[in-house]
């Protein structure tokens, strides 16, 4: 027998998802103690049977990695946590319906910024996710979001900005002054699902122009 939590043993049961890594988190309520233990179950939307998550039974930490169990990004899932404290009845709380495609946030991209004399090249590296293809390959964000694109900005002294946007991975800001420091920022966006990552930021200085030394 489980009851709805009126005892303040369990609060804020929710998924936190980033780049399709889906972590179930919760807080102990004011009535929880150091001996309160938590057990996690999950199920696919539309199914009746709850499945116990191995490794997240009678645990004391307040998180559980459900990435593998909720890895189908086209499906909806639920999870629930049952809290048990010495001498009291078990208390269960369930998440809202969860879809990693809708709810995941996007991390900043991994970028290499390469200074040249009069330009700065930016190479965006594909972001791997835990989502697997049918043949077992890890999918990149680009392979999941058709509309994914990169927004690149280059700042000079807070006064001047250059912009580039595109779906390719290689970019170059041209016509820059040699031996000058620039601040680059690169963001991932997916318009349809209105996702926007925090920017990757690189501070980079164009190379000095050595050609005068040979004239």
């Amino acid at each position: 027998h489980t009851t709805v939590d009126t005892s303040g043993l369990l609060q804020h049961v929710k998924f936190q998802s980033s780049n399709f890594e889906n972590i179930l988190t919760w807080d102990g309520g004011p009535a929880s103690t150091s001996d309160t233990v938590y057990s996690v179950e999950y199920k696919k939307y539309g199914e009746r049977k709850w499945l116990a998550k191995a490794g997240c039974q009678r645990i004391t930490q307040k998180f559980c990695n459900l990435t593998m169990e909720t890895r189908n990004h086209t499906e909806f899932y639920y999870a629930k946590v049952t809290a048990v404290s010495a001498g009291g009845p078990p208390v269960t709380k369930m998440t809202d319906r969860f879809s990693s495609l809708q709810h995941t946030t996007i991390k900043p991209p991994d970028v290499t910024c390469i200074p040249k004399v009069r330009s700065i090249q930016m190479l965006v590296h594909p972001t791997l996710t835990p989502v697997l293809s049918e043949d077992g390959h890890q999918l990149t964000l680009e392979e999941i979001f058709h509309d994914l694109f990169y927004r690149l900005e280059l700042h000079v002294n807070h006064t001047y900005q250059m912009h580039l946007e595109g779906k390719q991975r290689e970019y170059e800001f041209l016509g820059l002054t040699p031996d000058t420091e620039f601040l680059g920022s690169i963001t991932i966006l997916t318009p349809i699902l209105s996702k926007e990552s925090a920017p990757y930021v690189c501070r980079v200085k164009t190379l000095p122009d050595r050609t005068w030394a040979y004239s």
């Epitope: 049918e134 392979e143 058709h146 509309d147 779906k167």
Partner: antibody
């Protein structure tokens, strides 16, 4: 060199079915976005469907949802379009195309689909 | 869906003329606008991407401008080989949509 070669077009009655194929070579087919685009006689171009060959994620234009199915055989580097419940307004030249390095720059020569009684 | 309105639908030009084709989107598409050229019986050829970036191998008489909702393709001096249909394409979000096309003919 990137090559896309469509086949499978023909004359079909309204309500009938056709399966188009697109044989691809010269690029990494198993990790790409592949498209079907059509052009009705004397009309503009219309994107019909897209699939990511690795994730299997698909999108369709509203007018073909529930009737057309896009799929791939990655072992054979081939893209398919299964077209059911065909209507006269589906009459068009059907092209396959791919996105490489962010750009939709490679197209097949097209295959003619005519829906008529 | 994003609708692309292209104008004019056709135009007559003399060799050497400056020709301008415009495309308007029903919502902002940033710079996710490409221009394609299509000759009868041929597949579309990419001329300009990112609203203003010329595809490799495309003559410099072609240029593109614009961002947001309004875009322009200009041919600074029309040559005989430029007589064709031109389409704009928004590549911002699915479904990707083309303008209705502009047929450039000889006056």
């Amino acid at each position: 060199e990137v090559q896309l070669v469509e086949s499978g077009g023909g004359l079909v009655q309204p309500g009938g079915s056709l399966r188009l194929s697109c044989a691809a070579s010269g690029f990494t087919f198993s990790s790409s976005w592949m498209y079907w685009v059509r052009q009705a006689p004397g009309k503009g171009l219309e994107f019909v469907s897209v699939i990511n060959t690795r994730s299997g994620i698909t999108h369709y234009v509203e007018s073909v949802k529930g009737r057309f199915t896009i799929s791939t055989d990655n072992a054979k580097n081939t893209l398919f379009l299964q077209m059911n419940s065909l209507k006269s307004e589906d009459t068009a030249v059907y092209y396959c195309a791919t996105r490489i390095q962010g750009l939709i720059d490679y197209w097949g020569q097209g295959t003619q689909v005519t829906v008529s009684s | 869906d994003i609708v692309m309105t292209q104008s004019p639908s056709s135009l007559s030009a003399s060799l050497g003329d400056r020709v301008t084709i415009t495309c308007q989107a029903t919502q902002s598409i940033s710079t996710f606008l490409s221009w394609y050229q299509q000759k009868p019986g041929q597949t579309p050829k990419l001329l300009v991407y990112g609203a203003s970036r010329l595809q490799t191998g495309v003559p410099s008489r072609f240029s593109g401008t614009g961002s947001g909702t309004k875009f322009t393709l200009t041919i600074s001096g029309v040559e005989a080989e430029d007589l064709a249909s031109y389409f704009c394409l928004q590549d911002y979000s699915w479904p990707l949509t083309f303008g209705q096309g502009t047929k450039v003919e000889l006056k």
